[in-house]
Interface confidence: low
Amino acid sequence: ADNFSLHDALSGSGNPNPQGWPGAWGNQPAGAGGYPGASYPGAYPGQAPPGAYPGQAPPGAYPGAPGAYPGAPAPGVYPGPPSGPGAYPSSGQPSATGAYPATGPYGAPAGPLIVPYNLPLPGGVVPRMLITILGTVKPNANRIALDFQRGNDVAFHFNPRFNENNRRVIVCNTKLDNNWGREERQSVFPFESGKPFKIQVLVEPDHFKVAVNDAHLLQYNHRVKKLNEISKLGISGDIDLTSASYTMI
């Protein structure tokens, strides 16, 4: 595992210790996309191909997999869900100053929020944007999911699973064209049932960095490159959600 400093993580940014992000990385778990145990969906016994025909289970065949909101069909199950309304956005990334002046944070009002919760990201996401989610894991929790969404696509699915075959694991993935990609799995698991948590997601030019309780957890390389189109964060799972907000650092 590499040792990262915050300065390394944000080198060239002119801000070696941006507000709100963990000041020390410690020993970083192996990065997304190349660590041992990363696997294709369907690698476990009994799993069916994603996007399969009626009656087949999605990858990671456990209840609600992966990250479907209540009432939503399992991902990829035929037919796919309709896309949201609206005209397609113009190309090009919004500038940090234009789209997200560093005067935030913006986001949900204080107080308990109803889960699943959607946090609008009106200009998409941009490098140096920090999303902070505060809440408490419910007792006997099964799952948490953060879904950075582009219309029907999920650019970044962050999915702590408390009991997948009696193991705790964090699964990250992307859904494009009604279709889940290759899972990236992380065995470091900082969540505890019944305990409060803070999740921070820092958008970098090439990846998302995720820290939990002020400790770096993982990074996930951008598979959806048009960051300005990632216009919503869905928060779901077995949590009591206190706040969800973002700011520029």
């Epitope: 994603p50 996007g51 896309s83 219309g151 990609g181 598979r223």
Partner: antibody
Framework: EVQLVESGGSLVKPGGSLRLSCAAS????????MNWVRQAPGKGLEWISS????????YYADFVKGRFTISRDNAKNSLYLQMNSLRAEDTAVYYC??????????WGRGTLVTVSS | QSVLTQPASVSGSPGQSITISCAGT?????????VAWYQQHPGKAPKLMIY???YRPSGVSNRFSGSKSGNTASLTISGLQAEDEADYYC??????????FGGGTKLEIK
């Protein structure tokens, strides 16, 4: 039966315009992302453009940007490709294709566009 | 010029197995995106044979299999039959929401 039927292909002069249509049936059209793919005579497949179910996201291959426009009318179960400033190298069979399952799972039979003076 | 590289042609005898490769980059085949394979007989529309790297749609013979390693995807056809003679194309999604195709491989049954 799931079906896609293209129409509108014809002989057109360089610099001219043409509008291709694709009629979809047998599935819930609005639930699916759709594509246009073309194949020049004796050549390989070439992806042109895709459009999401709600028309919110639209993408083009670099070689048609600014000349071709993809659109859809979900009420009519129809997909369209407006082609302007046509060139000889645009001569091809144009396929209407449905996206699903990590691949393009339903193809029309294609419509021939010939650009020649 | 195609973004994904396939051999122009391969050949095999009935009953044999052949493999067609599809070389890409970390921006497409190797970038956690999904590779699909299509079969096209002369004068016909392409048909999806493999999706999501290695899965077969309903109705496709289990003689067709797909795999992916790094930036290269492969289509293997076992127990070659005369009707397998066709052109085969690989395709991948990219991070820019476009799709890319290989140049195609002509399979000849000797």
């Amino acid at each position: 039966e799931v079906q896609l039927v293209e129409s509108g292909g014809s002989l057109v002069k360089p610099g001219g315009s043409l509008r291709l249509s694709c009629a979809a049936s047998g599935f819930t059209f609005s639930n699916y992302n759709m594509n246009w793919v073309r194949q020049a005579p004796g050549k390989g497949l070439e992806w042109i453009s895709s459009i999401y179910g709600s028309s919110r996201y639209i993408y083009y291959a670099d070689f048609v940007k600014g000349r071709f426009t993809i659109s859809r009318d979900n009420a009519k179960n129809s997909l369209y490709l407006q082609m302007n400033s046509l060139r000889a190298e645009d001569t091809a069979v144009y396929y209407c294709v449905r996206s699903s399952y990590g691949g393009m799972d339903v193809w029309g039979r294609g419509t021939l566009v010939t650009v020649s003076s | 010029q195609s973004v994904l590289t396939q051999p122009a042609s391969v050949s095999g005898s009935p009953g044999q197995s052949i493999t067609i490769s599809c070389a890409g980059t970390s921006s497409d085949v190797g970038g956690s995106y999904n590779v699909a394979w299509y079969q096209q007989h002369p004068g016909k529309a392409p048909k999806l044979m493999i999706y999501y790297d290695s899965y077969r749609p309903s109705g496709v013979s289990n003689r067709f299999s797909g795999s992916k390693s790094g930036n290269t995807a492969s289509l293997t056809i076992s127990g070659l039959q005369a009707e397998d003679e066709a052109d085969y194309y690989c395709s991948s999604y990219t991070g820019y929401s476009t799709r890319v195709f290989g140049g195609g491989t002509k399979l000849e049954i000797k």
